[in-house]
């Protein structure tokens, strides 16, 4: 999906009003020195591409993020504020339902959510490219 035509300000507002707080709740009890962010993004569409990938694509050691509250709210925000996003996700959602597993918060998931927080920071403030 090409995130170029999303309403970035509305997505930012959704993130700051609820999603950010859900991420903090998920990470509660984790030391702020524990994880080193290795995934980066250069502009808002790129950031949303990386956020979508880390939030919804199962990875080795962390298969369950898509069922977390912050993921569901992220999906809703993208569906509302990115034209045509919902249609691209129907097949992906059906595939995800087939491999539904119980929620387990692993260290790998905590690391992945730490990466997500970093990507959202850059989405909110893509200051390093002149606006």
């Amino acid at each position: 999906y090409d995130f170029t035509n999303c309403d970035f300000e509305k997505i930012k507002a959704a993130y700051l009003s609820t999603i950010s707080k859900d991420l903090i709740t998920y990470m509660s009890g984790t030391k702020s020195t524990e994880f080193n962010n290795t995934v980066s993004c250069s502009n808002r569409p790129h950031c949303l591409t990386e956020i979508q990938s880390l939030t919804f694509n199962p990875t080795a050691g962390c298969a369950s993020l898509a069922k977390e509250m912050f993921a569901m709210k992220t999906k809703a925000a993208l569906a509302i504020w990115c034209p045509g996003y919902s249609e691209t996700q129907i097949n992906a959602t059906q595939a995800m339902k087939k491999r539904r597993k119980r929620k387990v918060t692993t260290n790998k998931c905590l690391e992945q959510v730490s990466q997500l927080q970093g990507l959202w920071r850059r989405f909110n403030r893509p200051l390093l490219k002149q606006q």
């Epitope: 702020s32 920071r121 909110n124 403030r125």
Partner: antibody, heavy 119, light 107 residues
Amino acid sequence: EVQLVQSGAEVKKPGSSVKVSCKASGYTFSNYLIEWVRQAPGQGLEWIGVIDPGNGDTNYNENFKGRATLTADKSTSTAYIELSSLRSEDTAVYYCAREDNTGTAFDYWGQGTTVTVSS
Amino acid sequence: DIVMTQSPDSLAVSLGERATINCKASQSVSSDVTWYQQKPGQSPKLLIYYVDNHYTGVPDRFSGSGSGTDFTLTISSLQAEDVAVYYCQQHHRFPLTFGQGTKLEIK
């Protein structure tokens, strides 16, 4: 506990350079932007620029382009600002600050470094 | 550059009374406004981010509102420890810019 500790006060001659350090602790240094802000005596706050310690990317206020250089050393979790061609108007308290967890504000600030430029 | 203009420059309010500080941007900054408090001889402290979100540990008597070009910081019941200079800041466009500051004193 997140802390930003800056180097001590400096007195410099006009035309010279100054380098101020900002040592971070209590968090992963490379994960958060470091901002630099200055405050002239009795005046308000002026944003100088920002650096991403993770990759060294910077962005500067045009008013300081060519005179200010921001760098970061991940091995020591220290950010630096170097200001060249100093003039009396550069007399100010220089602050480093860290972006907050959402990327929309500066949540931790250094104690400030006073730079005095005088002949 | 986006100019942030605060009003008034200084303000004297009685203890327990409401204090209101305004901030006007020279062009729309959406909701990208932050408020800081600076006490004499100290570094600035974050109060409110993204217009109306309280930073951790900031008392409920502080609140922010507004959007576009007009923003307000309100202290609902002034306490002695609130004596300080307050700054608004926009982070919507480069360069980031601050208001000139509003000095709040006890009447």
